[in-house]
Amino acid sequence: GITSINCSGDMWVEPGEIFQMGMNVSIYCQEALKHCRPRNLYFYKNGFKEEFDITRINRTTARIWYKGFSEPHAYMHCTAECPGHFQETLICGKDISSGHPPDAPSNLTCVIYEYSGNMTCTWNTGKPTYIDTKYIVHVKSLETEEEQQYLASSYVKISTDSLQGSRKYLVWVQAVNSLGMENSQQLHVHLDDIVIPSASIISRAETTNDTVPKTIVYWKSKTMIEKVFCEMRYKTTTNQTWSVKEFDANFTYVQQSEFYLEPDSKYVFQVRCQETGKRNWQPWSSPFVHQTSQETGKRNWQPWSSPFVHQTSQTVSQVTAKSSHEPQKMEMLSATIFRGHPASGNHQDIG
């Protein structure tokens, strides 16, 4: 942009150098050249000469008018055509910007990732503003009334060391730019309720060679939280629909979960957990791919029931990924199926 330009005159913008996108804008150029009575005054936008809506106001001043200016940024300068000069003479230049006042930040969420030592708050900023917009995060203790503020761009990490005096807080976000200010709704936060357990990882999987082959998935977490509720979702790589199996987990040892799956198929598994009874989930773990073994004998194979399995009342839901690129976004389907486990087994995945 034109940051430091030696002007031989002045250039100014109405309503101002930063204005609301879509507004009508007038840009004025006033020359103060020595030894020049300009024949013409010219305007340039981003280096290109403008030809329309230019008015010569008097000997020294001209104006260009833009209807509904909608470019986020432009570099304007003006020149004079001086008699006897082969080249135009620069008068002045200005950077101009158009944008929007901020939307009220929405979907404010604050979580503490276990062991991180931070409370991380995120929000939706709304539509693009196109101009520099600051976010001020307010954190007010409901017990001491003390308020802290943090400047942010799109999220903030607040050290839990600075949240020692209280467990209950009110959090809100203020969006500020030169065109306006908006506040998010206030979020009530209890620090004990927003902890997300340390990441869960699927370490390996194996398919047994039994008459009815079963796949055992091994998974673990370094969490110190005692009561953890988890979901494991799985599907064949060719399928759009996920099945979801639920567990109460105790991570003092590696979890083992059993599945009766289609033979000779490639499956994807992912797991996520939350503290039991709380609302914040871990993100889904990295996809873990496992190939089930080939069917050895011919038999009437049914994936969800067999003579060796009795049913429990826990459900396996089915969800459909909106797109293969966005596995996190899911749409619940109404199908419900029972999950089975071996009658003799005493495995820890029974939740």
Epitope: E17, I18, S97, I131, D132, K134, I136, Q148, Q149, Y150, L151, A152, S153, V156, K157, S162, V176, N177, S178
Partner: nanobody, 116 residues
Framework: QVQLQESGGGSVQAGGSLRLSCAAS????????MGWYRQAPGKERELVSM???????FYADSVKGRFTSSQENAKNTVYLQMNSLKPEDTAMYYC??????????WGQGTQVTVSS
Amino acid sequence: QVQLQESGGGSVQAGGSLRLSCAASGYTYSSCTMGWYRQAPGKERELVSMLISDGSTFYADSVKGRFTSSQENAKNTVYLQMNSLKPEDTAMYYCGCATLGSRTVWGQGTQVTVSS
């Protein structure tokens, strides 16, 4: 850590003017987004003006057209020129230095009292 010291407050009649100054010391001043805030008795602290890094300035609706913020980098000082003061402008005025991801640092404040 930056330290801030406000000055220039006082008592004035409605319609009068005051110019507040905020002198900053400390190595992080250059990375500060500087703002002026005020807190009236029994009310929350509110943002009055903020110098935004693209060279623009935010003004609260209640002061637009009456207050002007400016910055003198050589002196590490920001100013708040307050014209056409009203009784509802009576408050403790604070300057604040905000850096990305860090807790906002406040000055001690300067009292402005506008009588009718």
